[in-house]
C-alpha cells in the first residue's frame, strides 16, 4: 500500500509537471514560432534591400574593382588638360609681352638717340673749349656711348607658332573627354549592363600627342631669360642723370649749364616713361617663361608615360570587365543566398536546441 501510494504521488507529481510543461508548450511555443518566423522577415528585408540596391551593391563591387586601374590615368590626363590651358595663357602673356617689349625698346632707343643728339649739341657750346669746363664736357662726351638701349630686346622672337599649335590642341575638349571617362565609370552602379569600354576617346590620345609636339619643350628659354636679367639701357639712367646734373652744377651759370640740366631731366623722364615699363614687361616675360619651362620640361616623357598608363587601363577594361562582372555577380548572388542559408541554420539550431 505504501509503495502504491508513493508511486501514485510520484505519478501525480510527474503528471502535474507534464501538464505544466504541456501548458507551457501550448502557451509559449506559438510565441517562439512567431519569433522564429519574424526573423524570416528580417532576412527577407536584408535580401530585398540588396536586390533593390543592386546598383550600389553589385555595381559598387564592380566599380571598386575597376576604379584603381582607371581613375589614376584619368586624373593624370585631367591634370594635363589643366596644363594645356595654363600653357596657352602663358604663351599669350609671353607673346603680347614680347610684342610690347619690341615697341617699348624701339621707343627707348629713339628717346636715347634724341637725348644724345641734344647732349652733343649742348657740348658744342664754346664754354666746352675753355678750361676747366672742357674737362667736364669731355667727361660727359665720353659717357654718351653708355646711353644705348639693349638691341637684343628687339630681337627676341615671338611665339606665334607655339601659340597656334596650343590653340589647335585646345580645339579638342580634353577636359570633356576625361569627364566622359569619369562619367562612364560612375554610371556603372546604375547601369551594370552598360560598362565603359573606352577609358578616353581616341581624340584624347591624339590631343596629348599634339600637345607633346607643340614645340614648348624646344623653345630657347635661356635666350629669353638672359634678356630678363639685363638692363634695358646700357647704364642705370637715373644714376647717369644725377651724375650729369652734378657735372652741370660744377659749370658756371649759363646756357651750357641750363641745357645739360634740361638733358638730365629728360633722361630722368626717359627712365620713368620708358625704362620702368620695359622692366615691368621683362618681369612679366620672366614669369611666363618660367611657367612654360616648367610645363615643357620633360613634356614628351610625361605624355609617353600617360599614354602607356592609358593603354594599360584600356587593356584592363577591355580584357577584364566581363570577368569582373561575372565574379561580382556570383559574389552578389552568394551574398543573398547566404542570408537565407544563415536563417535556415539558425531555425534548425533554435528548434532543436532552444524549443
Amino acid at each position: 500500500n505504501h509503495q502504491v501510494r508513493t508511486r501514485i504521488k510520484r505519478s501525480r507529481k510527474l503528471a502535474d509537471s507534464n501538464f505544466k510543461d504541456l501548458r507551457t508548450l501550448l502557451n509559449e511555443t506559438p510565441e517562439q514560432i512567431k519569433y522564429i518566423l519574424a526573423q524570416y522577415n528580417t532576412t527577407k528585408d536584408k535580401a530585398f534591400t540588396d536586390l533593390n540596391s543592386i546598383n550600389s551593391v553589385l555595381g559598387g563591387g564592380i566599380l571598386d574593382r575597376l576604379r584603381p586601374n582607371i581613375i589614376p590615368v584619368l586624373d593624370e590626363i585631367k591634370s594635363m588638360a589643366t596644363a594645356i590651358k595654363e600653357t596657352k595663357e602663358a604663351l599669350e602673356n609671353m607673346n603680347s609681352t614680347l610684342k610690347s617689349l619690341h615697341q617699348q625698346s624701339t621707343q627707348l632707343s629713339s628717346s636715347l638717340t634724341s637725348v644724345k643728339t641734344s647732349l652733343r649739341s649742348s657740348l658744342n657750346d664754346p664754354l666746352c673749349l675753355v678750361h676747366p669746363s672742357s674737362e667736364t664736357c669731355n667727361s660727359i662726351r665720353l659717357s654718351l656711348s653708355q646711353l644705348n638701349s639693349n638691341p637684343e630686346l628687339r630681337q627676341l622672337p615671338p611665339v606665334d607658332a607655339e601659340l597656334d599649335n596650343v590653340n589647335n590642341v585646345l580645339r579638342t575638349d580634353l577636359d570633356g573627354l576625361v569627364q566622359q571617362g569619369y562619367q562612364s565609370l560612375n554610371d556603372i552602379p546604375d547601369r551594370v549592363q552598360r560598362q565603359t569600354t573606352t577609358v578616353v576617346a581616341a581624340a584624347g590620345r591624339k590631343n596629348l600627342q599634339d600637345f607633346a609636339a607643340c614645340g614648348i619643350d624646344r623653345m630657347n628659354y635661356d635666350s629669353y631669360l638672359a634678356q630678363t636679367g639685363k638692363s634695358p639701357a646700357g647704364v642705370n639712367l637715373l644714376s647717369f642723370a644725377y651724375d650729369l646734373e652734378a657735372k652741370a652744377n660744377s659749370l658756371p651759370p649759363g646756357n651750357l649749364r641750363n641745357s645739360l640740366k634740361r638733358d638730365a631731366q629728360t633722361i630722368k623722364t626717359i627712365h620713368q616713361q620708358r625704362v620702368l615699363p620695359i622692366e615691368q614687361s621683362l618681369s612679366t616675360l620672366y614669369q611666363s617663361v618660367k611657367i612654360l619651362q616648367r610645363t615643357g620640361n620633360g613634356l614628351l616623357e610625361r605624355v609617353t608615360r600617360i599614354l602607356a598608363s592609358l593603354d594599360f587601363a584600356q587593356n584592363f577594361i577591355t580584357n577584364n570587365t566581363s570577368s569582373v562582372i561575372i565574379e561580382e555577380t556570383k559574389k552578389y548572388g552568394r551574398t543573398i543566398i547566404g542570408y537565407f542559408e544563415h536563417y535556415l541554420q539558425w531555425i534548425e539550431f533554435s528548434i532543436s536546441e532552444k524549443v
Epitope: K99, H102, Q103, T106, Q107, S110, L112, R154
Partner: antibody
Framework: EVKLVESGPELKKPGETVKISCKAS????????MHWVNQAPGKGLKWMGW????????SYADDFKGRFAFSLETSASTAYLQINNLKNEDTATYFC??????????WGQGTTLTVSS | DIVLSQSPAIMSASPGEKVTISCSAS?????MYWYQQKPGSSPKPWIY???NLASGVPARFSGSGSGTSYSLTISSMEAEDAATYYC?????????FGAGTKLELK
C-alpha cells in the same frame, strides 16, 4: 595673310598737304610698330621714322622732323603719313612697313607722290 | 647713325655666274638684313639675321659676315635675280639702309 594696302598715287602742288593711308590686315594691328620709308625717283631707301601702334607715339628720323606727321586710326587698323607744306623734293614713293624683330618684314605696295607746280 | 656702304653700286653678271655684293658698316652690328627690289615694286625681305633666307627665296642665295663686314652671295646667277639689293641694320637706332647695289643681267 598679312597685307598692307596703301592709298593711291597723289599729284600735289607745292605748299599743299597730303595724307597717305596704310591699311593693315591679317594680324593684330597693335602688335607691330609701323614704319615709313621714302624712296626718291632713282634713289635708295630712306627710313623716315615709325609710330608705336600700342601708344600712338611717333618718332621721326632727323631729316623728317617738322612737316611730317604719323598718326593712327586703330579701330580701322590704319596708319597715316601726313606731309604739310609740300615741296618739290618730297616727290617720292612712300612705303609703310611693319617691323617685328629688327627688320621690315611686310611692306605696302607704295604710294607715289608727285609735287609739281 | 651707323652708315652702311654697299659695293659695287652697279654690276652685271651672266647666267650661271657667281655674284657677291658687300656691305660695310661704320661700326659693329650684330646682324645684317638684305632686301630685293625690282622696278615698280616694294622691297622684299630677302635675307634676315645675316644668313637666314626669307620665305620663298631660292637656295642659290646666301648671306654671311660679322662685325662690320657682310655679304650677299648668289651661287649661280639667274635672269630673275636681276634687281637692286639693299643691306639694312637695326642693331643701333635709327635703322639705316645701304645705298643699294643694282644687279643687271649680262
Amino acid at each position: 595673310e598679312v597685307k598692307l594696302v596703301e592709298s593711291g598715287p597723289e599729284l600735289k602742288k607745292p605748299g599743299e598737304t597730303v595724307k597717305i593711308s596704310c591699311k593693315a590686315s591679317g594680324y593684330t594691328f597693335t602688335d607691330y610698330s609701323m614704319h615709313w620709308v621714302n624712296q626718291a625717283p632713282g634713289k635708295g631707301l630712306k627710313w623716315m621714322g615709325w609710330i608705336n601702334t600700342e601708344t600712338g607715339e611717333p618718332s621721326y628720323a632727323d631729316d623728317f622732323k617738322g612737316r611730317f606727321a604719323f598718326s593712327l586710326e586703330t579701330s580701322a587698323s590704319t596708319a597715316y603719313l601726313q606731309i604739310n607744306n609740300l615741296k618739290n623734293e618730297d616727290t617720292a614713293t612712300y612705303f609703310c612697313a611693319t617691323d617685328y624683330g629688327d627688320y621690315f618684314d611686310y611692306w605696302g605696295q607704295g604710294t607715289t607722290l608727285t609735287v609739281s607746280s | 647713325d651707323i652708315v652702311l656702304s654697299q659695293s659695287p653700286a652697279i654690276m652685271s653678271a651672266s647666267p650661271g655666274e657667281k655674284v657677291t655684293i658687300s656691305c660695310s658698316a661704320s661700326s659693329s652690328v650684330s646682324y645684317m638684313y638684305w632686301y630685293q627690289q625690282k622696278p615698280g615694286s616694294s622691297p622684299k625681305p630677302w635675307i634676315y639675321r645675316t644668313s637666314n633666307l626669307a620665305s620663298g627665296v631660292p637656295a642659290r642665295f646666301s648671306g654671311s659676315g660679322s662685325g662690320t663686314s657682310y655679304s650677299l652671295t648668289i651661287s649661280s646667277m639667274e635672269a630673275e635675280d636681276a634687281a637692286t639689293y639693299y643691306c639694312q641694320q637695326y642693331h643701333s637706332y635709327p635703322p639705316t639702309f645701304g645705298a643699294g647695289t643694282k644687279l643687271e643681267l649680262k
